[in-house]
Amino acid sequence: EPERCNFTLAESKASSHSVSIQWRILGSPCNFSLIYSSDTLGAALCPTFRIDNTTYGCNLQDLQAGTIYNFRIISLDEERTVVLQTDPLPPARFGVSKEKTTSTSLHVWWTPSSGKVTSYEVQLFDENNQKIQGVQIQESTSWNEYTFFNLTAGSKYNIAITAVSGGKRSFSVYTNGSTVPSPVKDIGISTKANSLLISWSHGSGNVERYRLMLMDKGILVHGGVVDKHATSYAFHGLTPGYLYNLTVMTEAAGLQNYRWKLVRTAPM
């Protein structure tokens, strides 16, 4: 007839795909089973190994991330229960949709994490790593995206995503993105026969430089770059009475925005 065990938990730890549990038998040798289960798995026997005279262990691999596993050390009908949760995993892919980026918004997307996730934390940081915005999104198979609004044009941002499952959080993965700089406002033209004086006022947000281009039938005939503080630029050596396409391009954070205008030099 088997003896009833008296046991105490020695150690337990979990990673994203594995758990380890160790326990001690107090008193005389006895018979026991270590059983583990999850809400989707059913019950199974945990293969037990002996560490020393009184200590036993079980290591399980290839488990589902972010999942709660119940361990029951049972002897006859006497049991100790240990609840362990594997660490959730962050999304495998996380990025910014460039085609959905505007001057004041960034759209991020991700693929669902493998394993169990209850929510995702998405946080937005500026270039100085100051947190600007953060949001917690409930896990959904159909909705793995988010748009940050009210941002500063022409700025670089870092975005972090963290998967949350129960009381555990995954490590964070990062991506970066930039808002489109604002175009210039109020382009003014002062025309002469051989020159054009261009003036403008700044749009909102950050600017690194302005690039001005004068095109003739799609061919660049004159161009120049000025710093972010400039509000005017002059083109010289132009043909009198000629129609040009003027583009004033704003550049910041690796992106560009522009305004264009048809301008004609004064006739002779």
């Epitope: 007839e1 088997p2 009833r4 018979n31 026991f32 089973s33 270590l34 059983i35 289960s37 989707t40 798995l41 059913g42 019950a43 199974a44 026997l45 037990t48 049972i74 002897s75 006859l76 009908d77 006497e78 049991e79």
Partner: antibody, heavy 122, light 107 residues
Framework: EVQLVESGGGLVQPGRSLRLSCTAS????????MNWVRQAPGKGLEWVGR??????????YYAGSVKDRFTISRDDSKNIAYLQMNSLKTEDTAVYYC?????????????WGQGTLVTVSS | DIQMTQSPFSLSASVGDRVTITCKAS??????VAWYQQKPGKAPKLLIY???TRHTGVPSRFSGSGSGTDFTLTISSLQPEDFATYFC?????????FGGGTKLEIK
């Protein structure tokens, strides 16, 4: 030697009550969970319910077909498990087995009694 | 409740044959499955537990396999004393449930 002896079976009218007993010997009764399983004549096995030990607060579990009608209890001082059957129906006619189950060395073992026949008929 | 669907319902075989009985759980039960043999007028006898572990004294011709939802009991070479009814049972979660049984008859 492990022994489980069921008693209390017999003929009973529908709507009446009956109490079955399972007297255990040959093992530490108070350390083991006890089950009742039944088998209608010519049919398969149906798990009726289970009672756990004192350290598990004598927790009980039942099959849906008997919930709220049947009650399992135990008297550890006498080594007896009971099955109280109320509001009996003709479909409760069966041989009722008392079953001990226990977790041993990476094992789940069951021991069965020889059963007692309950006939529900008017 | 977890349903245990056992097949076939009955099976005719000869001494020396290899026989396979299957049990399908309606949801994951891990490996918490037992197999029993029952002869007429007798209580069931435990053959296999944890899906694949033979109980003490059970001949090696009996073997169990499976995990999750699909389980199999195999008798490698039928002996005259093996003609009986076989049941599977899940003990992963309450209520514990049995399969409907497979009657193994002499051909």
């Amino acid at each position: 030697e492990v022994q489980l002896v069921e008693s209390g079976g017999g003929l009973v009218q529908p709507g009446r009550s009956l109490r079955l007993s399972c007297t255990a010997s040959g093992f530490t009764f108070n350390a083991n969970a006890m089950n009742w399983v039944r088998q209608a004549p010519g049919k398969g096995l149906e798990w009726v319910g289970r009672i756990r030990t004192k350290s598990n607060n004598y927790a009980t579990y039942y099959a849906g077909s008997v919930k709220d009608r049947f009650t399992i209890s135990r008297d550890d001082s006498k080594n007896i498990a009971y099955l109280q059957m109320n509001s009996l129906k003709t479909e409760d006619t069966a041989v009722y087995y008392c079953v001990r189950d226990y977790y041993g060395s990476s094992a789940w073992i069951t021991y069965w009694g020889q059963g007692t026949l309950v006939t529900v008929s008017s | 409740d977890i349903q245990m669907t056992q097949s076939p319902f009955s099976l005719s075989a000869s001494v020396g044959d290899r026989v396979t009985i299957t049990c399908k759980a309606s949801q994951h039960v891990g490996t918490a499955v037992a197999w029993y043999q029952q002869k007429p007028g007798k209580a069931p006898k435990l053959l296999i537990y944890w899906a694949s572990t033979r109980h003490t004294g059970v001949p090696s011709r009996f073997s169990g396999s499976g995990s999750g939802t699909d389980f199999t009991l195999t008798i490698s070479s039928l002996q005259p004393e093996d003609f009986a009814t076989y049941f599977c049972q899940q003990y992963s979660s309450y209520p514990f449930t049995f399969g409907g049984g497979t009657k193994l008859e002499i051909k």
